[in-house]
Every structure is written in structure tokens, then in C-alpha cells.
């Protein structure tokens, strides 16, 4: 049956409403018109809308939709942005502390090596930072470069301190001998395995968080198609053309329209769920040698062990190297690099009282739990938009896109829409190119995450056991094992608690005596935990 005639034969209500959208009344008919030029709000009788008004309604409808999407994703978007920043900063802090521990170990145990050692250690940890952030650096090369650089200094300063200046040209020969003679034993290989595994996982974790931001940003700024704009206009605004200002769209009708408009976005749902679950698997596996906090903060100890290994074999090595490098060409040895902020002031060693003992590991688990709140985010979007735009409760006395109905029927609405456009066709078009691109990126990261994920209960890799790890005693969730110094295994309670009770925030990068205590920001980053019973490099 035809709709009731506009209650206001002068289009007055329509004019006053439309003026809020578009100042000026030149587009609004003063009295109802046939509306034969209308393309969206097809009239069954006289109408208070013009073609220009329709265009404005379409624009407004699409803007409304974009705003609703943005408000839907606000919390999730900030959660990922905030955590990506927090973890990036936390990883940088771990790297800085690892560097400082290593420098402190050199200063306390091998003061004669410090000027050059500081330089090599600095370069190594700079590369570590760059690698985490995605640089195309080979971890094995980084470790090799560190030991290649260290050995000539160890040889000339520790093993052969009385070497005349004229003999300092054997640098290149010593670098070569370091690998050929395996002067550090298996320690470089051990470090390569630990560092590459932990950094790889860290890097993919950060990459995944950054992709999460990209996914949300993509759907957040989605531009809806013209067809969708027409559907939304018909749902939200066409009733106004008939003077039905207070009528709300039927809930069922809204759901149908949203399924059409959001079909592409909802296609992300499957890959989004997989993304969160794959990220969870990765995080579950980030312990022991897959946890960079654990590995990097224990490096000083392994490097110390490697130097002790060289010293133990000094006699044998000196003889062999003496023969091997005796005929090296005369070459000027470059002057040692002395950083200005070389010396560690004892005043820098401060006790930091941290309220919360919290590891990066616990932060990661917390993030995953929070992300799981949003696992159904994409499938929930159509419902969210309908529930945040005006819809009639119980689908009674509502607008079905064409007329006021007593009860919404999807079938009737579909029949009524046939001439106007095909909803099925809109769904069949497939997602927007940007959505397809982001789905491809999600598929790729999910694949990477799955490849990297470690079976939860797996003991350390077999090849690591062969390289000096004892893997007994490590099954318990509470006790995590890492490679130790001197007395074999170190057990660290609740993973590595990084700088709490006695937290030496030893920052060699800062001016002497000026400890830069990295303070937790807004309680959103507190990576300072206690070192448990890990041997501190600061004795």
C-alpha cells in the first residue's frame, strides 16, 4: 500500500532537518514534488527530496559509516599502537642494559681491553637493535664480527701483553686465526644460536604488532562504495523524503544492509582470528633461548666464559699463532677508539625500588589476553554499527527502505529492492583492493608466526645441548633455564626478572655519574625487574 502522505504538506520539517546537514535551502523543495530525477529514494508519490539532497544524504551516510567504524576500533587500535611502542622501547632498554652489563664485565674483569672492547660491544648491540627493527643484517655475521674484533685485542693485551709495537700488524692474521683455530671454542656458535633465535622471534613479534596497526588503520579509513552509499542513504535518510522524520529503520533491514556494505571487511575476520591465535602461540614459545630478555642479559656471562676459555688455552694458542702469524706483512695498527663516556662512575650504581616485578614475558601474556577480547571484532562490526545507529526495537513500525511497515520481512524488502539494485551482487563483488591487500599481509604474517611458533613444552634444541647446555631441571613453568657462567646452569625464577630489587641501571652511554634511570611511563612500561640469582656483572 502507498505510504501516508507527508504530514507536512510544505516540506517544512524536511527543510529544517536538511539545513542542519547543509546550510542554505536552495536544494529543498518548498512543497512535495514528483521526484522523477531521484535515483536512490525512489518515490511512490510526491517527495520532499531533490537529486542534490540525495547526493548530500549519500555523502553524509558514508561519512557516518566511516565515523562509526572509527569509533568501533578506537580501543583496539590504541591497544596495539600503545603496545607496539611499549615493546619496542622495552626491547631497546633490554639491549642497552645488555650492552652495559657486557661493558661492565670487561671493565671489572679485563680493564686492559676496555677501550677497544667498548667499541666492539657498542657496534654489536647497535646491530642487534637494528636487526630487531627490521634491518637486513645477518646475526651470524654480527657475532663473528664481535669475536673477530675482540680476539686481536685479547691476544695482544692479555695473552701477549709484552708484544712489541712492531708486532701489532698481525691484526688481520689474528682475525683469521680466530675462526680457523676455534680459539673461543663453541661459544661463538652458542651465542649465534641463542641470539639469532631470540632476535628472530622478537623481530617477528614487533612486525606482527605493526601489521595489526596497519590492519586496523586500513579498515578504519575504508572508503565505502557508491552502492553501499545508496543502501545506507535508503536506510537512514529516504524516510525523510516522505516527511517521516521520527521513523527508525528496521533492525533486520539494518543487518541486511550492513552485511552488504561490510562483506569485504568481514572477510578479514577469519585471518584476524588466526592472527591473534598465532601471535598467542608465538608468545607462548618466547622463553629460554627464544626470549631476548633472557638471552641478551645473559650474554655478558657467556662472553666472559669465552674469554676464560681462551685464557685456559693461552699457552697452546700462543705457540700456534706465533707460527701462523709470524710472517704477516708490516701494517700500521689503527689507533684505539676511546669513547668519551668510557668510565663507569660507582655513583651510577643505584638501587631501584620497583613496585611491580614484571617481566617482558608477563607483559606479552597480558597483551595477548587483552587482544583475545577483540578476536571477534570484525564479525561484530555489522552488529555494532546497527546498534550504534537508530534502529527500531523489535522490528515493529519501522522503515524498510521503501515504506513504513508494521513488521519487517526480509523477503518483502528484498523484492522491493530488486529494481533498485542487487544486494547479492554487491556482496559478490568481493572486497575492496585495500582489504584484499591487508588480507594477503595477514595471511603472510600468520604463516610466519606459525613457522616461528615453538611447541609449548619443548626442551631446548638438541644441538644446543651438544654445545654445553644442560637441559635437565627445566620442565617447570616457574623455573626457566639459561646458559650460565662458571658454575654451569643458572636458574632464573619466573623467567629473567630484569632489574628489580637490586637494579643496576648502569648506562655507559650517559655522562659519567649521571645515571639515566629509565622511568616507567604512565605505568605502561616497566621492564625493570630483579635479576634473580643471575650472576651480576657488577661485583
Amino acid at each position: 500500500q502507498p505510504p501516508p502522505p507527508p504530514p507536512d504538506a510544505t516540506c517544512h520539517q524536511v527543510r529544517s532537518f536538511f539545513q542542519r546537514l547543509q546550510p542554505g535551502l536552495k536544494w529543498v523543495p518548498e512543497t512535495p514534488v514528483p521526484g522523477s530525477d531521484l535515483q536512490v529514494c525512489l518515490p511512490k508519490g510526491p517527495t520532499c527530496c531533490s537529486r542534490k539532497m540525495e547526493e548530500k544524504y549519500q555523502l553524509t551516510a558514508r561519512l557516518n559509516m566511516e565515523q562509526l567504524l572509527q569509533s568501533a576500533s578506537m580501543e583496539l587500535k590504541f591497544l596495539i599502537i600503545q603496545n607496539a611502542a611499549v615493546f619496542q622501547e622495552a626491547f631497546e632498554i633490554v639491549v642497552r642494559h645488555a650492552k652495559n652489563y657486557t661493558n661492565a664485565m670487561f671493565k671489572n674483569n679485563y680493564p686492559s681491553l676496555t677501550p677497544q672492547a667498548f667499541e666492539f660491544v657498542g657496534e654489536f648491540f647497535t646491530d642487534v637493535s637494528l636487526y630487531i627493527l627490521g634491518s637486513d643484517i645477518n646475526v651470524d655475521d654480527m657475532v663473528n664480527e664481535l669475536f673477530d674484533s675482540l680476539f686481536p685485542v685479547i691476544y695482544t693485551q692479555l695473552m701477549n701483553p709484552g708484544l712489541p709495537d712492531s708486532a701489532l700488524d698481525i691484526n688481520e692474521c689474528l682475525r683469521g686465526a680466530r675462526r680457523d683455530l676455534k680459539v673461543f671454542g663453541n661459544f661463538p656458535k652458542l651465542i649465534m644460536t641463542q641470539v639469532s633465535k631470540s632476535l628472530q622471534v622478537t623481530r617477528i613479534f614487533l612486525q606482527a604488532l605493526n601489521l595489526g596497526i596497519e590492519v586496523i588503520n586500513t579498515t578504519d579509513h575504508l572508503k565505502f562504495s557508491k552502492d553501499c552509499g545508496r543502501m545506507l542513504t535508503r536506510m537512514w535518510y529516504c524516510s525523510y523524503c516522505q516527511g517521516l522524520m521520527m521513523v527508525k529503520p528496521c533492525g533486520g533491514y539494518c543487518n541486511v544492509v550492513m552485511q552488504g556494505c561490510m562483506a569485504g571487511v568481514v572477510e578479514i575476520d577469519k585471518y584476524w582470528r588466526e592472527y591473534i591465535l598465532s601471535l598467542e602461540e608465538l608468545v607462548n614459545g618466547m622463553y629460554r633461548i627464544y626470549d631476548m630478555e633472557n638471552v641478551l642479559l645473559g650474554l655478558f656471562s657467556t662472553i666472559h666464559d669465552s674469554i676464560q676459555y681462551v685464557q685456559k688455552n693461552a699457552g697452546k694458542l700462543t705457540t700456534t699463532i706465533g707460527k701462523l702469524c709470524a710472517h704477516s706483512q708490516q701494517r700500521q695498527y689503527r689507533s684505539a677508539y676511546y669513547p668519551e663516556d668510557l668510565f663507569i662512575d660507582k655513583k651510577v650504581l643505584k638501587v631501584a625500588h620497583v613496585e611491580h616485578e614484571e617481566t617482558l614475558s608477563s607483559r606479552r601474556r597480558e597483551l595477548i589476553q587483552k587482544l583475545k577480547s577483540f578476536i571477534s571484532f570484525y564479525s561484530a562490526l555489522p552488529g555494532y554499527i546497527c546498534s550504534h545507529s537508530p534502529v527500531a526495537e523489535n522490528d515493529t513500525l519501522c522503515w524498510n527502505g521503501q515504506e513504513l511497515v508494521e513488521r519487517y520481512s526480509q523477503k518483502a524488502a528484498r523484492n522491493g529492492m530488486k529494481n533498485q539494485f542487487n544486494l547479492h551482487e554487491l556482496k559478490m563483488k568481493g572486497p575492496e583492493p585495500v582489504v584484499s591487500q591487508i588480507i594477503d599481509k595477514l595471511k603472510h604474517i600468520n604463516q610466519l608466526l606459525r613457522t616461528m611458533s615453538m611447541p609449548k613444552g619443548r626442551v631446548l634444541d638438541k644441538n644446543l645441548d651438544e654445545e654445553g647446555f644442560e637441559s635437565g631441571d627445566c620442565g617447570d613453568d616457574e623455573d626457566e633455564c639459561i646458559g650460565g657462567s662458571g658454575d654451569g646452569m643458572i636458574k632464573v625464577k619466573n623467567q629473567l626478572r630484569f632489574l628489580a630489587e637490586l637494579a643496576y641501571d648502569l648506562d655507559v652511554d650517559d655522562a659519567p655519574g649521571n645515571s639515566q634511570q629509565a622511568t616507567p611511563k604512565d605505568n605502561e612500561i616497566s621492564t625493570f625487574h630483579n635479576l634473580g640469582n643471575v650472576h651480576s656483572p657488577l661485583k
Epitope: 568501533a72 578506537m74 580501543e75 583496539l76 590504541f78 600503545q82 582470528r273 597480558e366 589476553q369 587483552k370 583475545k372 577480547s373 577483540f374 578476536i375 571477534s376 571484532f377 564479525s379 561484530a380 555494532y384 604512565d522 605505568n523 605502561e524
Partner: antibody, heavy 119, light 107 residues
């Protein structure tokens, strides 16, 4: 629409245990966290913990560790909370509440279950 | 744990009034704050999440805002059905914590 239907009131003796339930409908139960909240008579709200029915993952408020045990049965879309070694301090209304999928806030709440601990 | 403080435990206002209920966090919570309404019969509803987002079905006379660690819920044009106790809750850091509640009565 989303509904959380909680089990009826319980009168239990000190030292005993009680298990209360929360049946969910109108949404994918497995994919949303279920929270439990305590409210003592005339007092405010306290978060006990949450459970993710999809994989049984939990997180407890330290204050309720050892007191409350959360569980979920996906087949019946029902979440459970068991309270053990009950004392008069445990007399309260206990609510279940769903988190997600647009916020970590508690989007829908059950009507509450009154637990009275009395000799 | 993060302490959430609602300094006003009860307040009374007239129908049609504009009412503001405040809540303060002991440390930064990055806008992870919800407001809940508990009616006298005990039923609890989410009103606002993430500081200022209105939950579905909640009348637009409810709004939320923040200033640093201070958060507020505003009800414009108070109606009889708004008689209830209002709780804020942070979900930035585990364990999630609630404010003590503000009971709203009609004068």
C-alpha cells in the same frame, strides 16, 4: 540478543565449597572472556578473574587465587566458578560478565547469584 | 593494584538536572575506563567504555570524558530511571579494579 543466566541462590556452611554457573546465549561463547565479579552486601564491586572458554586461559585477581576456580564448558556455553573453604567474608552476590568484542569492558552482565555462608 | 576513587559516595539531584560523577585513578590508565550503572534491583549495565564511547542502547544523555587521571560521567537532563549507583572501572592493568560507587538519588 546476549543473555547471561546465572544459577540460583546458595546457602552453604563455613568450610564448604560452592559452584555457581552462568549460561550464555546470543553470542559465540568460546570467543569472549567471561569475568566474575564479587559484591558484598551494601559494598562495591571486585573483579575476581576471567576465563577464555575457547582454550581455558584464565587470569585471576591475586586476592582470589586459591579461593576461586574458574571453568567453562563450551558444549553447554556455561561458565562456572567454584569457591572453596568458604567463610562469612565470602557471603556476597557474584556476577558473571562478558568482555568484548569491541571493548575489554564488561558489555553484558548476569543477574547475579547470592551466596550466603552461614552455620 | 590501581586504586579507583569515587570521592562522592552519594549525591542527589532534581529531574532535568545535569549531573557529573567523577572518578580518579591512582596512576595512568590510558583511557581504559568503563562506567556501569547498577539499578536498585541489582542489575548491572555497561554505559560507557574506553572513557567516552557509548555502549549500544544507552541514551545519548550519558557521556564520558577525562582529564589526566581524572574521569567523569555526565548525565544531562536527569530522568527517573537514572536512579542507580554508578561505578567506574579501569581495565588498563591487571587486576581490573572498580571505584567505590556513587549513589544517585532524586531530590
Amino acid at each position: 540478543q546476549v543473555q547471561l543466566q546465572q544459577s540460583g541462590p546458595e546457602l552453604v556452611k563455613p568450610g564448604a565449597s560452592v559452584k555457581i554457573s552462568c549460561k550464555a546465549s546470543g553470542y559465540a561463547f568460546s570467543n569472549s572472556w567471561m569475568n566474575w565479579v564479587k559484591q558484598r552486601p551494601g559494598k562495591g564491586l571486585e573483579w575476581i578473574g576471567w576465563i577464555y572458554p575457547g582454550d581455558g586461559d584464565t587470569n585471576y585477581n591475586g586476592k582470589f587465587k586459591g579461593k576461586a576456580t574458574l571453568a567453562a564448558d563450551k558444549s553447554s556455553s556455561t561458565a562456572y566458578m567454584q569457591l572453596s573453604s568458604l567463610t562469612s567474608e565470602d557471603s556476597a552476590v557474584y556476577f558473571c560478565a562478558r568482555s568484548g568484542p569491541i571493548t575489554m569492558g564488561f558489555t553484558y552482565w548476569g543477574q547475579g547469584t547470592l551466596v550466603t555462608v552461614s552455620a | 593494584d590501581i586504586q579507583m576513587t569515587q570521592t562522592t559516595s552519594s549525591l542527589s539531584a532534581s529531574l532535568g538536572d545535569r549531573v557529573t560523577i567523577s572518578c580518579s585513578a591512582s596512576q595512568g590508565i590510558s583511557n581504559y575506563l568503563s562506567w556501569y550503572q547498577q539499578k536498585p534491583d541489582g542489575t548491572v549495565k555497561l554505559l560507557i567504555y574506553y572513557t567516552s564511547n557509548l555502549h549500544s542502547g544507552v541514551p545519548s544523555r550519558f557521556s564520558g570524558s577525562e582529564s589526566g587521571t581524572d574521569y567523569s560521567l555526565t548525565i544531562t537532563n536527569l530522568e527517573p530511571e537514572d536512579i542507580a549507583t554508578y561505578y567506574c572501572q579501569q581495565y588498563s592493568k591487571f587486576p581490573w579494579t572498580f571505584g567505590g560507587g556513587t549513589k544517585l538519588e532524586i531530590k
